[in-house]
């Protein structure tokens, strides 16, 4: 999906008002210095591409993020503010949802959500030069 036509300011507002809090809740009990940020993004469409991938694509050691509250809210925000997103993405993530087993919070998942927090922070500051 091409995130170029999304309403970035509205997505940012949804992140600041609700998604960010759910990410913090998920990471509660974890030190902010525990994980290094290894995933980066260069602009807002790129950030949303990386956020979409890390949130909804199962990875080795963490196959269970799509049912988390922050993930459902991310999906809702993208569905509302990115025209055409639902048609191209929702059915695929719902198919994965059916295949997935029970929710397990592994260290790998915590690391992945830490990366997500970094991507969202970068999404919110698009004018900053890439480090």
């Amino acid at each position: 999906y091409d995130f170029t036509n999304c309403d970035f300011e509205k997505i940012k507002a949804a992140y600041l008002s609700t998604i960010s809090k759910d990410l913090i809740t998920y990471m509660s009990g974890t030190k902010s210095t525990e994980f290094n940020n290894t995933v980066s993004c260069s602009n807002r469409p790129h950030c949303l591409t990386e956020i979409q991938s890390l949130t909804f694509n199962p990875t080795a050691g963490c196959a269970s993020l799509a049912k988390e509250m922050f993930a459902m809210k991310t999906k809702a925000a993208l569905a509302i503010w990115c025209p055409g997103y639902s048609e191209t993405q929702i059915n695929a993530t719902q198919a994965m949802k059916k295949r997935r087993k029970r929710k397990v919070t592994t260290n790998k998942c915590l690391e992945q959500v830490s990366q997500l927090q970094g991507l969202w922070r970068r999404f919110n500051r698009p004018l900053l030069k890439q480090q």
Epitope: D7, K10, A14, S17, T18, I19, M72, K73, K75, A76, A77, A79, I80, W81, P83, G84, S86, E87, I90
Partner: antibody, heavy 120, light 111 residues
Framework: QVQLVQSGAEVKKPGSSVKVSCKAS????????ISWVRQAPGQGLEWLGV????????IYAEKFQGRVTITADTSTSTAYMELSSLRSEDTAVYYC?????????????WGQGTLVTVSS | QSALTQPPSASGSPGQSVTISCTGT?????????VSWYQQHPGKAPKLMIY???KRPSGVPDRFSGSKSGNTASLTVSGLQAEDEADYYC???????????FGGGTKLTVL
């Protein structure tokens, strides 16, 4: 049973406000969109706005911006639509309608409608 | 803010096919595959018949079909039956600000 149940008919004076409720049951209220659509006597359907409780997002039709307020109480699975500065042209049946999960612009479940009459 | 344009009436005999058109712009029907159709009998709430241009919700007979070409969407009812007599409304997503437009409605009469 999956349904939307709306509050009863209202008679209001011009210039006043009306608040209509819509109680959802049988589905996870928060992750759907709840839209409000009205139909004046003998006229077509007119979309007023939508709320997606999951992310607390509301979007209003330009025509009603500033005059309509849509809210939701997830603890009771109830959505509300308040229309202010009522005039006679606002006399209509007001429907709440469920927008499909993540496809909020398709209304697959409707309330029974609430008749709002504006008359002096 | 303008509604989508539908003919006010359409008719056909039992067993025949009838097509109802719905014309918009590149900002709504032409820009997205997010067209839906609703059936409304007198005194009743509308019922979703078609969504995503041509998909039918479960329980809707396959006599109802939808299509789109450019800025115009169409609903075809084939094998007309008496119970198909109703008002039909098209609807289209119209962007993140406007969200939804309805057509003015078409009264379908089964002769």
């Amino acid at each position: 049973q999956v349904q939307l149940v709306q509050s009863g008919a209202e008679v209001k004076k011009p210039g006043s406000s009306v608040k209509v409720s819509c109680k959802a049951s049988g589905f996870t209220f928060g992750s759907y969109g709840i839209s409000w659509v009205r139909q004046a006597p003998g006229q077509g359907l007119e979309w007023l706005g939508v709320i997606v409780p999951l992310v607390d997002v509301t979007i209003y039709a330009e025509k009603f911006q500033g005059r309509v307020t849509i809210t939701a109480d997830t603890s009771t699975s109830t959505a509300y639509m308040e229309l202010s500065s009522l005039r006679s042209e606002d006399t209509a049946v007001y429907y709440c309608a469920r927008g499909q999960e993540y496809f909020y612009w398709y209304f697959d479940l409707w309330g029974q409608g609430t008749l709002v009459t504006v008359s002096s | 803010q303008s509604a989508l344009t539908q003919p006010p009436s359409a008719s056909g005999s039992p067993g025949q096919s009838v097509t109802i058109s719905c014309t918009g712009t590149i900002s709504d029907i032409g820009g997205y595959n997010r067209v839906s159709w609703y059936q409304q009998h007198p005194g009743k709430a509308p019922k979703l018949m078609i969504y995503e241009v041509s998909k039918r919700p479960s329980g809707v007979p396959d006599r109802f079909s939808g299509s789109k070409s450019g800025n115009t969407a169409s609903l075809t009812v084939s094998g007309l039956q008496a119970e198909d007599e109703a008002d039909y409304y098209c609807s289209s997503y119209a962007g993140t600000d406007t969200f939804v437009f309805f057509g003015g409605g078409t009264k379908l009469t089964v002769l």
